[in-house]
């Protein structure tokens, strides 16, 4: 299976790292090459190298290899950061366990099973032997390290320094014994790099011999390092693509850890009477689907065969025939006992009421002093005193420490949307708490909307390229794709962030989504040179009732002539009535033959009261909504446009003033559109961008 071109799979990669030799006696060999694969081939074969190659660095800028007879664990060497360098270390020299019989073991254990020190291979004292380093080139018979040059049963061994004991095996564990995982291994980040049948895993950053979509840069949180076994997609256990062209993928033999506990960040909030979120933590005993059909037992294969067994999904509590959500579906479900209906959702289980009785806040909750200490997604709040540094980073005054006791929900930064807390979860640094405004509370949370006190535009002018304002550029327009298709619009407001609508996500599996930037055509035809396709790494839902989502991209967009960001308005600003604005989208046009190109409809801002009259008084707009009517009868946003922007210009600056969300029909004459008012949520957007970690380009 070890073909020449695949030797890079035998190396552990450390990106942006090089090795510096402190000991001048250490040798190095360099040469100009095109790829890291070429470096790996030469290192593995030791071709033309005056030493045994243990590691190499690929200099991407100079297209150069630096081969080393040492690695990062050697003495006289130190690691150093360097943007243009990638360090590759031969795994055989850094592994402290064996695969199979341990023929490839090149570690530094030098004591036998019974504790006797090994005799050096180059020595004939106390035991004469024929295992000379010169006779076994490539077997690394260095020093007195345990080796298995002939691949014999029993694993690595050595001649011992005890004249009474000629040789003995060394006690080096099998890698499959050392490695262990919890549950189904979704959080496994170990170093197993071969499958249960012994096939070497394909590197995740390679597309040969098998093309795949699990690219490390697209899924930075999945731990796609080198060619280690991982479980990115909810399989029963970790797996990998293999180097065997005839075997696309295989499971890895990783045992379950003796102390099979999940990481805190993995544990969904357990509930028994109701569903929290998607119901992954539901542990109740409802055992029929929504229409009363009984569930099939999870440990049964009748009437439906499946692999969702208790053995395969160890931490998902697949007991009896209770409704569960082991795979991240939209809610708990089960296989049914009706042979004609394979699965059904248990949608009769109520959602948990998170409003905690009488707990409520007034205004924006800055004086809330209740003792709720859980976020709306069920995460436990972390202590305020552990997070003061982060808090100081986004507020410019000294918070009232007397209010910030324990881990209770509070509002120290005057957030317009109520009390919140830090979570201790690096993916969700903070979130709002499930507390509502007190009934009858009319305290405004932002300035009176009837008086245009704040201008929406910041003072800076529109960027100018070659002396011409880029007024025709719509590079901030995003096509959100779901399973190959355009589903919604969105606005690129920062290199790693897209503002869109919560209605755009029919599934919570982020693998199903992509963001297309720089396109004009809904299918990307003719846009190949300017199109950027980015995966989605996280969804951050807006404050309760906002319908907004901030979508984090797996890597930052590259800003160029075709892709740009659009500005946000000032918080709480008002835009004058009759201001001319535009909506953009690839949605439903009503045309029999649509050309697929991005369309624009011109609207003008209408005051909330006037807007309500146009809707025959059936709707009352609040401070979180903005209204715009069509200049041309029958034009406006529709299905497929949701998530897209309402763009207005003020002081020669274009900004996203509204987000399109499903309304009351499409482009009905004399019925203005109602959009989410971005200015009302501007502080929330800035706070997310400031506090959430994004991948570096």
């Amino acid at each position: 299976q070890r073909k020449r071109r695949n030797t890079i799979h035998e190396f552990k990669k450390s990106a942006k790292t090089t090795l510096i030799k402190i000991d001048p006696a250490l040798k190095i060999k360099t040469k100009k090459v095109n790829t890291a694969d070429q470096c790996a081939n030469r290192c593995t074969r030791n071709k033309g190298l005056p030493f045994t190659c243990k590691a190499f660095v690929f200099d991407k800028a100079r297209k150069q290899c630096l081969w080393f007879p040492f690695n990062s664990m050697s003495s006289g060497v130190k690691k150093e950061f360097g943007h243009e360098f990638d360090l590759y270390e031969n795994k055989d020299y850094i592994r402290n366990c064996i695969i199979g019989k341990g023929r490839s073991y090149k570690g530094t254990v030098s004591i036998t099973k019974s504790g006797i020190k090994c005799q050096p291979w180059s020595s004939m004292i106390p035991h004469e032997h024929s295992f000379l380093p010169s006779s076994y080139r490539g077997k690394d018979l260095q020093e007195n390290y345990c080796r298995n040059p002939r691949g014999e049963e029993g694993g690595p061994w050595c001649f011992t320094s005890n004249p009474e004991v000629r040789y003995e095996v060394c006690d080096i564990p099998q890698c499959s014994e050392v490695e262990c995982m919890t549950c189904n291994g979704e959080s496994y980040r170990g170093l197993m790099d071969h499958t249960e049948s012994g096939k070497i895993c394909q590197r995740w950053d390679h597309q040969t011999p098998h093309r795949h979509k699990f690219l490390p840069e697209r899924y930075p949180d999945k731990g796609f390092d080198d060619n280690y076994c991982r479980n990115p997609d909810g399989q029963p256990r970790p797996w990998c693509y293999t180097l065997d062209p005839h075997t696309r993928w295989e499971y890895c033999a990783i045992k379950t850890c003796a102390d099979n506990t999940m990481n805190d960040t993995d544990v969904p909030l357990e509930t028994t009477e109701c569903i929290q979120g998607q119901g992954e933590g539901y542990r109740g005993t409802v055992n029929t689907i929504w229409n009363g059909i009984p569930c099939q037992r999870w440990d049964s294969q009748y009437p439906h065969e499946h692999d969702m067994t208790p053995e395969n999904f160890k931490c998902k509590d697949l007991r009896e025939n209770y409704c569960r959500n082991p795979d991240g579906s939209e809610s708990p479900w089960c296989f049914t006992t009706d042979p004609n209906i394979r699965v059904g959702y248990c949608s009769q289980i109520p959602n948990c009421d998170m409003s905690h009785g009488q707990d409520c806040y007034r205004g924006n909750g800055k004086n809330y002093m209740g003792n709720l200490s859980q976020t709306r997604s069920g995460l436990t709040c972390s202590m305020w005193d552990k997070n003061m540094e982060d808090l100081h980073r986004h507020i410019f005054w000294e918070p009232d420490a007397s209010k910030l006791n324990e881990n209770y929900c509070r509002n120290p930064d005057d957030d317009a949307h109520g009390p919140w807390c830090y979570t201790g979860n690096p993916l969700i640094p903070w979130d709002y708490c499930p507390i509502s405004r007190c009934e009858g509370d009319t305290t405004p949370t932002i300035v009176n909307l009837d008086h245009p006190v704040i201008s929406c535009a910041k003072t800076k002018q529109l960027r100018v390229v070659n002396g011409i304002p880029t007024r025709t550029n719509i590079g901030w327009m995003v096509s959100l794709r779901y399973r190959n298709k355009h589903i919604c619009g969105g606005s690129l407001i920062k290199e790693s962030w897209v503002l869109t609508a919560r209605q755009c996500f029919p599934s919570r599996d982020l693998k199903d989504y992509e963001a297309w930037l720089g396109i004009h055509d809904v299918h990307g035809r003719g846009d190949e040179k300017c199109k950027q396709v980015l995966n989605v790494s996280q969804l951050v839902y807006g404050p309760e009732g906002s319908d907004l989502v901030l979508m984090k991209l797996a890597r930052p967009a590259v800003l160029d002539d075709f892709v740009s960001t659009i500005d946000l308005p000032n918080y709480g600003c008002t835009i004058p009535e009759k201001t001319s604005c535009s909506v953009y989208g690839w949605g439903y046009t009503g045309l029999i033959n649509y050309d697929g190109l991005l369309r624009v409809a011109h609207l003008y801002i209408m005051g909330n009261e006037k807007c309500s009259q146009h809707h025959r008084g059936k709707v009352t707009l609040n401070e979180s909504e903005i209204c715009a009517g069509a200049e041309k009868i029958g034009s406006g946003p529709c299905e497929g446009d949701y998530g897209g922007p309402l763009v207005c210009e003020q002081h020669k600056m274009r900004m996203v003033l509204g987000v399109i969300v499903p309304g009351r029909g499409c482009a009905i004459p004399n019925r203005p559109g109602i959009f989410v008012r971005v200015a009302y949520y501007a502080k929330w957007i800035h706070k997310i961008i400031l506090t959430y970690k994004v991948p570096q380009s």
Partner: antibody
Framework: QVQLQQSGAELMKPGASVKLSCKAT????????IEWVKQRPGHGLEWIGE????????NYNEKFKGKATFTADTSSNTAYMQLSSLTTEDSAIYYC?????????????WGQGTLVTVSS | QIVLTQSPAIMSASLGERVTMTCTAS???????LHWYQQKPGSSPKLWIY???NLASGVPARFSGSGSGTSYSLTISSMEAEDAATYYC?????????FGAGTKLEIK
């Protein structure tokens, strides 16, 4: 106006394969998905899958993977569905329909259907 | 998969009568992704209502659609002879796309 013209009825033996066609006129063929739907008496309508002729992109209902294969010829504005290893269960009317260009859109135009009968 | 249950399976109505048929989904469906088709014997289905409440081109104004979440309905304000047909609801919320078993509307 938009029209989808399907090929004529087919009488097939079990185990054989059949290739149905759907010729589109009156719109830009490459810009809309072509949907395939099966209708058996007493079984209602079943979605088989779809193809975007411009890119050759396909989505299949898991149930029909291995049974149906979609292709499209943009020079003749024709979409094809091949059904393999036919059994009596495959006897049905097969419709092609025009899907939208965005997720969630309805099937706004339908072909007249092709009746496939599988019998020994 | 999302199962769509239509009721009643068969119904008859007098001319001029108000008719309502329902479509219940096994899990929540976005109103943007719920459509209705009309099919008459020997003909192919026709798009009738898209995105819950929008009438397709040429559909008489006596038809209307409404609903959200798991519960949707199609209503005819005043039954006419040409409305006798089978009506199918269809969800595009989640793959595989599914259709209801249909409601057959007959003239009394």
């Amino acid at each position: 106006q938009v029209q989808l013209q399907q090929s004529g009825a087919e009488l097939m033996k079990p185990g054989a394969s059949v290739k149905l066609s759907c010729k589109a006129t009156g719109y830009t063929f490459t810009g809309y998905w072509i949907e395939w739907v099966k209708q058996r008496p007493g079984h209602g309508l079943e979605w088989i899958g779809e193809i975007l002729p411009g890119s050759g992109s396909t989505n299949y209902n898991e149930k029909f993977k291995g049974k149906a294969t979609f292709t499209a010829d943009t020079s003749s504005n024709t979409a094809y569905m091949q059904l393999s290893s036919l059994t009596t269960e495959d006897s049905a009317i097969y419709y092609c329909a025009r899907g939208g260009y965005y997720y969630g859109s309805s099937f706004d135009y339908w072909g007249q259907g092709t009746l496939v009968t599988v019998s020994s | 998969q999302i199962v769509l249950t239509q009721s009643p399976a068969i119904m008859s109505a007098s001319l001029g009568e108000r008719v309502t048929m329902t479509c219940t989904a096994s899990s929540s469906v976005s109103s943007s992704y719920l459509h209705w088709y009309q099919q008459k014997p020997g003909s192919s289905p026709k798009l009738w209502i898209y995105s819950t409440s929008n009438l397709a081109s040429g559909v008489p104004a006596r038809f209307s659609g409404s609903g959200s979440g798991t519960s949707y309905s199609l209503t005819i304000s005043s039954m006419e002879a040409e409305d006798a047909a089978t009506y199918y609801c269809h969800q595009y919320h989640r793959s595989p796309l599914t259709f209801g078993a249909g409601t057959k509307l007959e003239i009394k």
